[in-house]
């Protein structure tokens, strides 16, 4: 699987009524990338 | 098998509360982001609230809509997450899914109505 | 807030031949990484979302490869090479980037 993007510290920046993550990093903490094997939804991107 | 079964939903009057229940089950919880999102009859997707990981000290964010209003919160022991809805609106009427946006449950429907 | 538009908001189709959707993003949903936050779903009649495509252009698992994904920072199109009669439905483009997370207003693919 492609590394895990780095989300320490949850790394949001805050603007006046939203806020943005430094990357998506949603498929890193998909329910498919935590089955870990097998087929998932989320396959590594290439 | 993965699975998202919501849970809660009926029919409330205006300024009541609800609160609905995803239990998952199939695929190791504790680090999955999960969401809700809900869909009024007929129209489209509405994102309304999303929470993080432990390890992210469970960080929650909301949709102005429901802001105040609305809680999410999950327990990593029943994997398991909730949405407390309070002051409820007729706009809330909707179908609500928990969804952690590659999985989506069946739903679960709230009508708010006097 | 971003927000995401689609065209055509219906669509008929002929199954065999292909059919194309548009979304546009009010903003670039592209990171510093080259991710590229937008995402396709499809919601039959009747049922939940199913998602058909994430970063704009990965196919998810399970999805034929007839569908596609592809776009710059924000204009997006998923295309359809071959429609089936499966097809049917409303199609969705989503970002979740930037909060709040917002979806398109769907474009409707029914079957001439």
């Known amino acids: 699987l492609a590394d895990p993007l780095d989300h320490r510290d949850a790394g949001d920046l805050w603007f006046p009524g939203e806020s943005e993550s430094f990357e998506d990093a949603h498929v890193e903490h998909s329910i498919s990338r935590s089955l870990l094997e097998g087929e998932i939804p989320f396959p590594p991107t290439s | 098998e993965v699975q998202l079964v919501e849970s809660g939903g009926g029919l409330v009057q205006p300024g009541g509360s609800l609160k609905l229940s995803c239990a998952t089950s199939?695929?190791?919880?504790?680090?999955?982001?999960m969401h809700w999102v809900r869909q009024a009859s007929g129209k489209g997707l509405e994102w309304i609230a999303h929470i993080k990981a432990k390890s992210d000290n469970y960080a929650t964010y909301y949709a102005e809509s429901v802001k105040g209003r609305f809680t999410i919160s999950r327990d990593d022991s029943k994997t398991t997450i909730y949405l407390q809805m309070n002051s409820l609106k007729t706009e809330d009427t909707a179908v609500y899914y928990c969804?952690?946006?590659?999985?989506w449950g069946q739903g679960t429907t709230v009508t708010v109505s006097s | 807030d971003v927000v995401m538009t689609q065209s055509p908001l219906s669509l008929p189709v002929t199954p065999g031949e292909p059919a194309s959707i548009s979304c546009r993003s009010s903003r670039s949903l592209l990171t510093s990484k080259g991710i590229t936050s937008l995402y396709w779903y499809l919601q039959k009649p009747g049922q939940s979302p199913q998602l058909l495509i994430y970063r704009m252009s990965n196919l998810a698992s399970g999805i034929p490869d007839r569908f596609s994904g592809s776009g710059s920072g924000t204009d997006f199109t998923l295309k359809i090479s071959r429609v089936e009669a499966e097809d049917v439905g409303v199609y969705y483009c989503a970002q979740f980037l930037v909060y709040p997370y917002t979806f398109g207003p769907g474009t409707k693919v029914e079957i001439k």
């Open positions: 199939g695929f190791p919880f504790s680090n999955v982001w």
């Open positions: 969804t952690g946006l590659d999985y």
